[in-house]
Amino acid sequence: MAFSGSQAPYLSPAVPFSGTIQGGLQDGLQITVNGTVLSSSGTRFAVNFQTGFSGNDIAFHFNPRFEDGGYVVCNTRQNGSWGPEERKTHMPFQKGMPFDLCFLVQSSDFKVMVNGILFVQYFHRVPFHRVDTISVNGSVQLSYISFQNPRTVPVQPAFSTVPFSQPVCFPPRPRGRRQKPPGVWPANPAPITQTVIHTVQSAPGQMFSTPAIPPMMYPHPAYPMPFITTILGGLYPSKSILLSGTVLPSAQRFHINLCSGNHIAFHLNPRFDENAVVRNTQIDNSWGSEERSLPRKMPFVRGQSFSVWILCEAHCLKVAVDGQHLFEYYHRLRNLPTINRLEVGGDIQLTHVQT
């Protein structure tokens, strides 16, 4: 389904990070934290849902620890005092590996999914509507933090146009340190006019939200592949597209296409059989010149999760993978608003798409 009126994402924020949750937590709000656990000696990171920036009042402290075989601590801090810890002895994160961490706020609890799999439920100890800030700290690098407010309409068929999303703007720079890691672009380009988050049915008949039933997260949600959706308003400078997923263990290739009518304005084609990331444009069924150069090694790995952030600028698309700038692609089809369709196919499982 589409999520409408959503706060725009924080893109590649530096850690430690604190940012406002516009409107505070609401029943049905889904917050996705996408990043990579650092390989460094640090053994912990934390995501906090808190009141204000002081850290004295944390409704939900989610704290993976790479200690004693690995476990995750969940807790609440009120007026500077911690309550009893809830520990989950399974560790779903790996050092050096990207992750997709999703928090769904519901009336009774937080549901936490890691890489598309339900990991833990944390029952509210304080009223969640007091929360107005998210903070992340510790041994982690962030690609993005996105926010999804549920619509009260059923999910659209996979290949239909997604409902229109209300205008949103990139938020003001949050408090706290906001220096960019090297190789990542500015976090707050010009205002975005629409953001649509695509989530999917986990099984026939099951929906994330209906007017009567509170939204629910199901294990192993999977996007239909190939996944095709409309980019409302097409491309324009400052437009961002975010995708995350997992490369299948036996993957040969996958592709992300930005299309204009019958033409493929931008074809992003990681090829594991060639150890290459090929970029091209197809006009009238005719391919142009391939671009393959990369500033570092192939960033996609079989069996591993990834995030791709495509930022449209006036003259080019900037593409970052797992929060690190990878390449620029000068527009070849330059009538940007007509580039209004996203197609994803090949040997991956998608977990998150935001257009």
Partner: antibody, heavy 120, light 107 residues
Framework: EVQLVESGGGLVQPGGSLRLSCAAS????????IHWVRQAPGKGLEWVAR????????YYADSVKGRFTISADTSKNTAYLQMNSLRAEDTAVYYC?????????????WGQGTLVTVSS | DIQMTQSPSSLSASVGDRVTITCRAS??????VAWYQQKPGKAPKLLIY???SLYSGVPSRFSGSRSGTDFTLTISSLQPEDFATYYC?????????FGQGTKVEIK
């Protein structure tokens, strides 16, 4: 037969404004980008701006950004270049041009040009 | 912006000569280069697009080639009507840029 005809050139004082027109015929106007290219006396070609009439999407050279506005009226098959805050260095013959293919940038059809002189 | 450095700025040649004009791009522009011919008081005419594709109706004595960021326009046997100014243009970047021009004069 494809034709592009520019008009609207003339003498204008520095800081003044002028609007050029480019009347197109012989092809489906909305399907092709329209470019403005200028040539100062005795100098080379300089690309100025481009518009896609179907969407209204535009690009500008840095030298004119914020001063010039390109627009198009698909009902009249005409593109315009509104030039404000004109400077002496904007003196040139202004051509409108169309690419040889809907998705190309090499320009095969050009107007005859219209002279803009910025002088006090 | 991508700069297109054209050389020479002018040359003198005779009818029947082989003439070569070069354009160097300040960065990679793939094959996104066109060549134009312009005569005094006239609008430019498209000769070559995509670095080496001959535009319809252009005589086959004109040819284009690419080596990395260097682009060449060759006139295999100069004809009287070829005396003109020639421009290269890159369209890899949406901000189009032209070379400074090469004037081909009668020796």
């Amino acid at each position: 037969e494809v034709q592009l005809v520019e008009s609207g050139g003339g003498l204008v004082q520095p800081g003044g404004s002028l609007r050029l027109s480019c009347a197109a015929s012989g092809f489906t106007f909305s399907q092709y980008a329209i470019h403005w290219v200028r040539q100062a006396p005795g100098k080379g070609l300089e690309w100025v701006a481009r518009i896609y009439p179907d969407s209204g999407y535009t690009y500008y050279a840095d030298s004119v950004k914020g001063r010039f506005t390109i627009s198009a009226d698909t009902s009249k098959n005409t593109a315009y270049l509104q030039m404000n805050s004109l400077r002496a260095e904007d003196t040139a013959v202004y051509y409108c041009a169309r690419p040889y293919h809907q998705y190309a940038e090499g320009m095969d059809y050009w107007g005859q040009g219209t002279l803009v002189t910025v002088s006090s | 912006d991508i700069q297109m450095t054209q050389s020479p700025s002018s040359l003198s040649a005779s009818v029947g000569d082989r003439v070569t004009i070069t354009c160097r791009a300040s960065q990679s522009v793939s094959r996104a280069v066109a060549w134009y011919q312009q005569k005094p008081g006239k609008a430019p005419k498209l000769l070559i697009y995509s670095a080496s594709s001959l535009y319809s109706g252009v005589p086959s004595r004109f040819s284009g080639s690419r080596s990395g960021t260097d682009f060449t326009l060759t006139i295999s046997s100069l004809q009287p009507e070829d005396f003109a100014t020639y421009y290269c243009q890159q369209y890899y970047s949406p901000l189009l840029t032209f070379g400074q021009g090469t004037k081909v004069e009668i020796k």
